[in-house]
């Protein structure tokens, strides 16, 4: 049957008594029992006495009386009585406990740390107890954080418990520092101090500060340095494991660097003298801090003697492209110890030849690759102390994307005009590595008469590849290729001869090699108008006759054709538009705008100009005709000048009669 819990003579969960009084506490139970007492009471051999006796009806119960003479404030705590031996089926120990406050007005706190603060270890996010328990439950305690904060209990995150102190349910960085519990009793202020110390188990980083893998000659000394970086309040254990550990071959030195204001750096340096073949293998540095663990390892290789092997990484002939930001020329090298590296270009030290050449390990880096970087590159490897030398040569070809010479030197802002029926020679000169091939294409203009400009890709008509026998577009006399030396370079010149210029369009030459393709568009506009712009006067009229002027412009080069009359008013030349483009006649190659003034009078004399806008430059062009209506006194020829709108105008023929301007 289940034993009844032991019974204490003082009832309830807590009891308050005054310091200096004697505590009498009896425990009565159905079996032998023992006392569990506050730590300071257990140490009291003089004041404390426990007497055991048989009690109860027929003396069948077990009694134990605890007497504590002149009880002190620091005897405050839990007093419990529990059965000594409980049947194994009973998992829970049967006990009764009471918390006894031993009140002392001169000592409100059970433990006082008024001079040197007590260190409390804390972990962020975990419960933190500031153990300023009191000798009476009625004492009001305030928790302060240096310098000015008061941590006020809110019943939830911060709870006050007179038996434990302040319980902070999830401590934060705000609780790190000097915390003080304060109590005022009878007008007297008492303080007990605690210093919270956040001990972390964070390992920020672990490194072995030696190259990986480690290579050594037999008989040399191995030194491995393991570095662990942690936050300031972390301590670590560092251990090594290595191949010949059983023979304790290594000596290990440890040190800590606390000069950094943000972190601790722990060092563990492993040293093995006179390395042998048995010492080769994996060396591991293990770092532990509480539950945190990190490790790092490195392989150690032992060599009997110095050696160099060198091979081509890919093939012996390498290719790159001019204009590349950087090109790495590298060889596959295995060597020990590290050899000295020199690169030669065409037999001369490369890095001395150009600042664009840099040595990185067993590689040569060429910055901003140019054509001149092509050549033979040799790597020289030497371990002088061991008299070991090796070299290997690779050939670098620098390919160059094609360039068309005429594209670079062309200074024509407008497309050229080709007279109708003329023979024309078109040339494209290209350079590249490898030598580019040049092909010619024809892109016809859309022969819609309203179309004023022919652009490449301006319509859906495709481009046609050309050869000497092509019947696309204009008749071709020949297409020839020849080598030409221009600016000291071998260039490929391709010439296309147009036998009979009849159809407007675009000739395209395309130069290509394995690196890329470049094209040049040659606008081939046929004109049946001299210079692409022509003004014609049928005859200079006499008074009463009709004035007939015509203006013909190349339709691919000009638009917005208008006749204007220039008049001077108050020393300013005014332009009066006297016709519209709508009246123009569009033909295969040109646009003609006729101007007819019927039954002219002397007042119709003046400067007549045909104005058109250059399709490509947007510039307005004027072609002027001085018209003098012949009366009795003036029979001069008209003076014809082709000028831009920006040039000044002059009147070359005046009549002797009154002409209105």
């Amino acid at each position: 049957s289940k034993l009844k819990d032991p019974e204490l003579s003082l009832k309830g969960t807590q009891h308050i008594m005054q310091a200096g009084q004697t505590l009498h506490l009896q425990c009565r139970g159905e079996a032998a029992h023992k006392w569990s007492l506050p730590e300071m009471v257990s140490k009291e051999s003089e004041r404390l006495s426990i007497t055991k006796s048989a009690c109860g009806r027929n003396g069948k119960q077990f009694c134990s009386t605890l007497t504590l003479n002149t009880a002190q404030a620091n005897h405050t705590g839990f007093y419990s009585c529990k059965y000594l031996a409980v049947p194994t089926s009973k998992k829970k120990e049967t006990e009764s406990a009471i918390y006894i406050f031993i009140s002392d007005t001169g000592r409100p706190f059970v433990e006082m740390y008024s001079e040197i603060p007590e260190i409390i270890h804390m972990t962020e996010g975990r419960e933190l107890v500031i153990p300023c328990r009191v000798t009476s439950p009625n004492i009001t305690v305030t928790l302060k954080k240096f310098p000015l904060d008061t941590l006020i209990p809110d019943g939830k995150r911060i709870i006050w418990d007179s038996r434990k102190g302040f319980i902070i349910s999830n401590a934060t960085y705000k609780e790190i520092g000097l915390l003080t519990c304060e109590a005022t009793v009878n007008g007297h202020l008492y303080k007990t101090n605690y210093l919270t110390h956040r001990q972390t188990n964070t390992i920020i980083d672990v490194q072995i500060s030696t190259p990986r893998p480690v290579k050594l000659l037999r008989g040399h000394t191995l030194v491995l340095n393991c570095t662990a970086t942690t936050p300031l309040n972390t301590r670590v254990q560092m251990t090594w494991s290595y191949p010949d550990e059983k023979n304790k071959r290594a000596s290990v030195r440890r040190r800590i660097d606390q000069s950094n204001s943000h972190a601790n750096i722990f060092y563990s340096v492993l040293t093995i003298d006179k390395m042998q073949n048995k010492d080769k293998g994996l060396y591991t540095c293990r770092v532990r801090s509480g539950p945190s663990f990190k490790s790092v390892n490195t392989s150690v290789h032992i060599y009997d003697k110095a050696f160099i092997t060198v091979k081509h990484r890919k093939q012996q002939v390498l290719e790159t492209v001019a204009g590349k930001r950087s090109y790495r020329l590298s060889m596959k090298v295995k060597a020990f110890p590290s050899p000295e590296v020199v690169w030669l270009k065409d037999g001369l030290p490369a890095t001395e030849k150009s600042a664009r050449y840099l040595t990185r390990g067993y590689s040569l880096i060429i910055k901003d690759v140019t054509e001149e970087d092509a050549g033979n590159y040799t790597i020289l490897l030497s371990i002088k102390q061991s008299n070991v030398f090796k070299n290997l040569t690779a050939t670098l070809i620098v390919n160059v994307k094609p360039q068309i010479y005429e594209k670079a030197v062309s200074s024509f802002p407008d497309p050229a005009l080709y007279p109708l029926g003329s023979r024309q020679i078109l040339t494209c000169t290209a350079y590249g590595i490898p030598q580019p091939t040049i092909k010619w294409f024809w892109h016809p203009c859309n022969h819609n008469h309203s179309e004023a400009r022919c652009d490449f890709c301006s319509n859906n008509e495709e481009s046609f590849i050309l050869d000497a026998d092509s019947n696309m577009g204009n008749r071709i006399e020949s297409i020839t290729q020849r080598m030409a030396i221009i600016e000291g370079k071998n260039k490929m010149a391709s010439t296309l001869v147009v036998a009979d210029s009849r159809i407007s369009g675009i000739y395209i030459c395309i130069a290509s090699n394995k690196v890329g393709t470049v094209g040049r568009n040659i606008s081939f506009y046929i004109t049946d108008v001299p210079n692409g712009f022509h003004v014609n006067l049928e005859k200079m009229p006499t008074e009463g006759e009709d004035l007939k002027l015509s203006c013909t412009v190349n339709k691919f080069l000009y638009r917005d054709v208008t006749w204007i009359l220039l008049r001077t008013v108050n020393n300013r030349t005014m332009h009066y538009s006297i016709s519209k483009q709508k009246m123009a006649i569009t033909k295969e190659h040109s646009i003609t705008l006729n101007l007819t003034i019927m039954n002219v009078s002397l007042q119709d004399s003046g400067t007549y100009a045909c104005r058109a806008r250059n399709v490509y430059t947007g510039e307005e062009i004027l072609q002027k005709k001085e018209i003098t209506i012949r009366g009795e006194h003036c029979n001069k020829k008209a003076v014809f000048s082709r000028i831009s709108k920006f040039k000044s105008t002059r009147n070359d023929c005046t009549t002797q009669s009154n002409v209105k301007h």
Epitope: P137, N138, T150, I152, P153, G155, I159, W160, R163, S169
Partner: antibody
Framework: QVQLQQPGAELVKPGASVKLFCKAS????????IYWMRQRPGKGLEWIGE????????TFNEKFKTKATLTVDKSSSTAYMQLSSLTSEDSAVYYC??????????????WGQGTSVTVSS | DIVMTQAAFSNPVTLGTSASISCRSS???????????LYWYLQKPGQSPQLLIY???NLASGVPDRFSSSGSGTDFTLRISRVEAEDVGVYYC?????????FGEGTKLEIK
């Protein structure tokens, strides 16, 4: 003994602001939170927010975040609550209260008499 | 926000008999630390509210032991074992498990 003094009434115009005070005495002002509560006529209580007088830290009910500003003057042991952009909806009795959270042994809180704020033109 | 629900009026009680007032929360007020964050306040006519019960079952300082409280995580009852004339007023339940603190609308204790 612990006391929280509040003025009896304030009459303010719509759109204006009012600054209510709560003068504490009989205890160490910085050792306890000050809470502010609102009670509209015939209605229940609403918690506006709290201030820790030792460092001025405040926590608000989202509903009052733009309405109320809590401050303290440690030298005079006085807590203040400023209410801005007042409307007739803000007419209520405003209480300051000092709770003391002692979880196992005793717990006592103290309330001011409340300030009746009337918003009227 | 946690919603606290109360009846507006209690059943009228005779002086000297016991009375019960109920309150329900929209969420359990039991914290992982074992404390239930429920409070009972009494507001007597023309006075400021006063605390009766804190953390569900603890009697506030100076409150007569005629008052007691019990409940689960969401349903709570305030009991007055022998009602006296001075117990008349509006009883509010409140929670501070989560911000903001929220109060019930109050239950008026009526005497027969």
């Amino acid at each position: 003994q612990v006391q929280l003094q509040q003025p009896g009434a304030e009459l303010v115009k719509p759109g204006a602001s009012v600054k209510l005070f709560c003068k504490a005495s009989g205890y160490t002002f910085t050792n306890y939170y000050i809470y502010w509560m609102r009670q509209r006529p015939g209605k229940g209580l609403e918690w506006i927010g709290e201030i820790n007088p030792s460092n001025g830290d405040t926590t608000f009910n989202e509903k009052f975040k733009t309405k109320a500003t809590l401050t303290v003057d440690k030298s005079s042991s006085t807590a203040y609550m400023q209410l801005s952009s007042l409307t007739s909806e803000d007419s209520a009795v405003y209480y300051c209260t000092r709770p003391s959270f002692y979880s196992y042994d005793y717990y006592k809180d103290y309330w001011g008499q409340g300030t009746s704020v009337t918003v009227s033109s | 926000d946690i919603v606290m629900t109360q009846a507006a009026f209690s059943n009228p009680v005779t002086l000297g008999t016991s009375a019960s007032i109920s309150c329900r929360s929209s969420k359990s007020l039991l914290h992982s630390n074992g404390i239930t964050y429920l409070y009972w306040y009494l507001q007597k006519p023309g006075q400021s509210p006063q605390l009766l019960i804190y953390q569900m079952s603890n009697l506030a300082s100076g409150v007569p032991d005629r008052f007691s409280s019990s409940g689960s995580g969401t349903d709570f009852t305030l009991r007055i074992s022998r009602v006296e004339a001075e117990d008349v007023g509006v009883y509010y339940c409140a929670q501070n498990l989560e911000l903001p603190w929220t109060f019930g609308e109050g239950t008026k204790l009526e005497i027969k």
